[in-house]
Structure formats: C-alpha cells, structure tokens
C-alpha cells in the first residue's frame, strides 16, 4: 500500500480527525490530523517529539516548504471524506531532499530513511491522494 493511497476498506473504523497539537505544524493551511500518522506514530506527542528535532533545519531555510512537507508526514491532513492520512506529493519531498540533505550531511546526518520520497504518491489523483506545495508558504 502506497503512502496516501485511498483505500475504501481501510475507512471502516478509521480514527476520527483530531485538532493538530504539534507546535511546528501550526499555521500550515490545515488544522486537523489523524493518528497513527504515515510514520507509524500512534500519538501526536510521539510525533511532535521526533518532528521537533528538525526545527533547526527548518529555521535554516534550506527549502521553503520543508515544514509543510514534514508536517504532512508527522501530522498528515485529515478530512472526513477520506479514510487515510493525506501526505505531501513526491515532488515536494524530492525538492526538500535535494536542498536539505547536503545541509544535514554537513552536520554528519543523512536524509532519514523514514522520509523516503519513493514511498509517496507521484501526483495527486483519486487513487493516491497527496498535497501539492501550498502557494503562500
């Protein structure tokens, strides 16, 4: 199952949407998420703790949509119309990796396996919903 792929069967008993409580994911264009997220975190607290480690990289500004991209994985958008979490599309991930991986490498960190762009939908379509880069970010 591709990350973000729409699966009607999985919708039965899907967890309800919940307000985003992760500080880094405030003001990114949506305010509802669903757990577990796309990285397997079962609570927002667990997701927030790990996501926060990216704060210096986001502040560095290597990619304008990095925060939005990370939040799309750690606190994916939730809507009652779709049963699965909706991540960012693959191109945004590729751009973020292209620009930010070299910065991480300067500090002896590799691009995390958990952020493997190949797992994301290539483009937004009814069978693999994903989010394009926000225009105002």
């Amino acid at each position: 199952l591709e990350i973000g792929r729409f699966d009607p069967e999985r919708g039965r008993g899907a967890a309800p949407c919940q307000a985003v409580e992760i500080p880094m994911c405030r003001g990114i264009g949506y305010n509802l998420t669903r757990m577990p997220n796309l990285l397997g975190h079962t609570s927002q607290g667990e997701a927030a703790a790990e996501l926060a480690e990216f704060a210096p990289l986001v502040q560095y500004g290597c990619h304008s949509h990095l925060r939005f991209f990370l939040c799309s994985l750690y606190a994916p958008m939730c809507t009652d119309q779709v049963s699965t979490p909706i991540p960012a599309c693959r191109p945004m991930c590729e751009q973020a990796r292209l620009r930010c991986a070299p910065i991480m490498e300067q500090f002896n960190f590799g691009w995390p396996d958990s952020l493997d762009c190949a797992r994301l939908p290539t483009r937004n379509d009814p069978h693999a919903l994903c989010m394009e880069a926000p225009e105002n970010a």
Epitope: S43, A48, A52
Partner: antibody
C-alpha cells in the same frame, strides 16, 4: 534590548471583558510567537494560548476556548489578549511572553504582568 | 493534555547546598522541557530549555537533565538570590502545561 511592556492593572465586574496589551520592542515583532500565561494569587502558572504575529494564527487552551481572543497591531508591534465573560476565578496576573521556534525552546522574554481583578 | 508533576512541592536549604528538583510528564515529551525561576511579584525567568540547554545569561550552577518523562533541575551551590519558586513546562505539544512549582526557601 528586547522587552515586552504590558498595560496597567484593571478592575472589572463579573460578566465584563478585559483587554490587555503587550507592546514588543528590540526585535522583529513578526518573527516570534507571543504566549499568554496567567497566575492566580498564590497559585502556579497556567498557559492560556499562543499567537503568531506574522499571520495572526492562534492556538488556545481548551479551558479558554470561546472566551479568549488574541489579536495584534503590527504597526505598533502590539499584541492584545481579550478575555470575556469574566468571573471571580479570572482574578490573576496575566503575562505575555515571547517564544521562538514554535515555543520548543521555552519563553525567553516576559512582560511585567498585568493584574486583573474581577469583583462585584 | 499532558500533566506535569513536580517534587518536592517545597524545600528548605542553606546557601552552598546542592539542590535537586524533579519534574515528571504524564507521557513522553522527549527533551522538550523548560525550567523557570520566579520570585515574588516578578515575572518568571527562563533558566533551561530543551531539558539541558542553559539560557544565555543564566549562571552555570544551574543545570538540567532528563528525557522522556523524567527530568531534573539541579542547583550545584545554592546562592542567596536563588531562593524562589521553580516551574517546569512541557513544550512538546499544545496545550503547553506547567508543573505546580517547587518553592525553595531558606533553612
């Protein structure tokens, strides 16, 4: 130097509203969140909510949802916190505090506090 | 919401003593914890952020440690100006929550 200066003490009747101001100086106003924290007499600190002066985005503690409103005037680098339907339990010192990086690293600059007394 | 507890609620100590205050979160907050000092009639002052990072201008006798749910603030050698109330605060998720405070007074 970086500082937050708050408005003066207020005395209000139950059911009324109060609007406290917090004027920022010494840094880029829109770059850092402003949080509001209150402290009832002899009690501990209670986080009320956070406000992003850049886009006006707010997050409120559930307890205050529907009663608190945070706004800003970017021309004067001032953030406002309005609390409505006041009751005696709202008697407290209200602080504004600056927080960078989504609040992850704590609140590094605080206003001097505004005493709000609710009494009939 | 994440609940924060502190112990002890108060303690008496002498100048020069080593003082340790503990803070516990109801669920894991990784290292996202701050410590504040507050004196009567004054606003709180940030001492430690991200569990163990010393805020600029804060004396090195203050130190913080811990991760997950258990955290400690240590004052290696208590000074007269350190008699105050100390609060921990989790900054991992909204709503940010404070511990009830620990009052440090003169023995």
């Amino acid at each position: 130097q970086v500082q937050l200066v708050q408005s003066g003490a207020e005395v209000k009747k139950p059911g009324a509203s109060v609007k406290v101001s917090c004027k920022a100086s010494g840094y880029t106003f829109t770059s850092y969140d402003i949080n509001w924290v209150r402290q009832a007499p002899g009690q501990g600190l209670e986080w009320m909510g956070g406000f992003d002066p850049e886009d006006g985005e707010t997050i409120y503690a559930q307890k205050f949802q529907g009663r608190v409103t945070m706004t800003r005037d970017t021309s004067t680098s001032t953030v406002y916190m309005e609390l409505s339907s006041l009751r005696s339990e709202d008697t407290a010192v209200y602080y504004c505090a600056k927080a960078g990086d989504w609040g992850l690293y704590g609140m590094d600059v605080w206003g001097q506090g505004t005493m709000v007394t609710v009494s009939s | 919401d994440i609940q924060m507890t502190q112990s002890p609620s108060s303690l008496s100590a002498s100048v020069g003593d080593r003082v340790t205050i503990t803070c516990r979160a109801s669920q894991s907050i990784s290292r996202w914890l701050a410590w504040y000092q507050q004196k009567p009639g004054k606003a709180p002052k940030l001492l430690i952020y991200a569990a163990s990072s010393l805020q600029s201008g804060v004396p090195s006798r203050f130190s913080g440690s811990g991760s997950g749910t258990d955290f400690t603030l240590t004052i290696s050698s208590l000074q007269p100006e350190d008699f105050a109330t100390y609060y921990c605060q989790q900054t991992n998720t909204f709503p940010f929550t404070f511990g009830p405070g620990t009052k440090v007074d003169i023995k």
